[in-house]
């Protein structure tokens, strides 16, 4: 390609995070170039030999392709002449965790970033009124989190109360014995006030509101990825 | 062994209703991309839904609205249940995992919807 | 919605010689996601090829994948009697999640 050692392309890549049993991303870009077929991405994983996926001369070519990812990777064809040499990983296992690398050669040089790829579970938590309860009480389930997760209440009302005296929380393993369904039940809530069940672990954050009136439930839940 | 075996099929008139059953054994359900595909009869293969190990689901536009693809991890089974039947998804319904690809495939149950 | 289209239609050919299946993409597809299948008359598909090029557990060296992009091909090297059947390729991976070709059907000549 005509590349002299001297000629450096920036690539950048992002801590990414991936939700075991869904696909993921392992970002990474790099400075684009109009000639498609001068473009080579690689990404490797440290400590397996071979490749993870290659892609040279507009397609791909996984004949050196480490058994572990057959049949799971792809780049972003139609994306990499602007850039974006990010690599979607299907049906993401908690193995596939660990140290990738980017490198990239265009004709404009060469350039890697190496990027750490978290694996884990994380889902959205559902709060629900007990009303079965001897006291009204709420419910916060969520399905699927690994490793297992801090669960924490707090009150609009009662703004930095500890609830963890009148909260229960239970860890149930899932059939694949991996993940964890997660259920907290807070005792003793009083209605016109907004609850908050926190559930947290080294890969990702949710939070679920509910705001119990006389007339009406009002629900609210975000997932929010760490360090990504 | 890791086998799939459906259940469930049967005539039934347009407008109506069926749940399907597709019984795992030798892996779990859980931890696959679980999908449902179906064959109307001298026709081609057409993918109808998958739920992924997560739980999150999707289907194929021609069912989107009329069908809803679930599991239950205790009992290590995968269900299609169709709501609102036509004519045209009069079939063979096959349950398949897909690791890799969709390399195990139960035997598929017939679907005839028709008055 | 990624199309995939199948040529020929039907593929008439004698034992031991060899059949060429193409199966073409509307828009280019990953390798990875590209896959082949065997069916034959009242049974499931069966898995023959997946990530374009891999062959399936058990699938006898006779049959090869090859292609990237837009472009696949399914070599059968020399035809056994119990390869006619049809073939189906199909792709992972854009929306809908699945897709499937019409089918090549391979038949006795």
């Known amino acids: 390609f005509g590349i002299s050692g001297k000629h450096f392309i920036t690539v950048t890549t992002f801590t990414s995070a991936g939700n075991i049993g869904e696909d993921g991303t392992l970002s990474c870009t790099f400075e684009p170039d109009i000639k498609l077929n001068g473009i080579v991405i690689q990404w490797l994983k440290e400590g397996i030999k071979g490749l993870v996926h290659e892609f040279k001369e507009g397609k791909d070519d996984l004949s050196q392709q480490h058994e572990m990812f057959r049949g799971r990777t792809a780049v972003f064809a139609d994306q990499v002449v602007v850039g974006n040499a990010s690599l979607r990983l299907k049906n993401v296992q908690l193995t596939d965790a660990g140290t990738y690398t980017c490198y990239i050669r265009t004709s404009k040089g060469k350039g890697n970033a190496n990027l750490e790829y978290k694996t884990g579970a994380f889902s959205m938590p559902e709060i629900n009124v007990d009303y079965n309860a001897s006291s009204e009480s709420l419910r916060c389930e969520a399905p699927r989190w690994f490793p297992q997760p801090t669960v924490a209440w707090a009150s609009q009302v009662d703004q930095g109360a500890n609830f963890s005296e009148v909260s229960n929380t239970s860890f149930e393993l899932n059939s694949e014995n991996v993940t964890m369904k997660v259920v907290s039940v807070l005792y003793n809530v009083t209605i016109n006030n907004t609850y908050s069940c926190m559930i947290e672990n080294d890969i990702a954050k949710a939070t679920g509101d509910i705001k119990v009136t006389d007339s009406e439930v009002k629900r609210r839940s975000q997932l929010q990825l760490l360090n990504s | 062994e890791v086998q799939l075996v459906e259940s469930g099929g049967g005539l039934i008139q347009p407008g109506g209703s069926l749940r399907l059953s597709c019984a795992a054994s030798?892996?779990?359900?859980?931890?696959?991309?679980m999908n449902w595909v179906r064959q109307a009869p001298g026709k081609g293969l057409e993918w109808v839904s998958v739920?992924?190990?997560?739980?999150?689901?999707y289907y194929a536009d021609s069912v989107k609205g009329r069908v809803t693809i679930s599991r239950d991890n205790s009992k290590n089974t995968l269900y299609l249940q169709m709501n609102s039947l036509r004519a045209e998804d009069t079939a063979v319904y096959y349950c398949?995992?897909?690791?890799?690809?969709?390399?195990?495939w139960g035997q598929g149950t017939t679907v005839t919807v028709s008055s | 919605e990624i199309v995939l289209t199948q040529s020929p239609g039907t593929l008439s050919l004698s034992p031991g010689e060899r059949a060429t299946l193409s199966c073409r993409a509307s828009?280019?597809?990953?390798?990875?996601?590209l896959a082949w299948y065997q069916q034959k008359p009242g049974q499931a598909p069966r898995l023959l090829i997946y990530?374009?090029?891999s062959r399936a557990t058990g699938i006898p060296d006779r049959f090869s994948g090859s292609g990237s992009g837009t472009d696949f091909t399914l070599t059968i090297s020399r035809l056994e009697p119990e390869d006619f059947a049809v073939y189906y390729c199909?792709?992972?991976?854009?929306?809908?999640?699945?897709?499937f070709g019409q089918g090549t059907k391979l038949e006795i000549k």
């Open positions: 030798g892996f779990t359900v859980s931890s696959n991309y």
């Open positions: 828009q280019s597809v990953s390798s990875s996601y």
């Open positions: 398949a995992r897909d690791t890799y690809a969709m390399d195990v």
């Open positions: 990530g374009a090029s």
């Open positions: 739920i992924y190990g997560s739980g999150r689901t």
């Open positions: 199909q792709q992972y991976g854009s929306s809908p999640m699945y897709t």
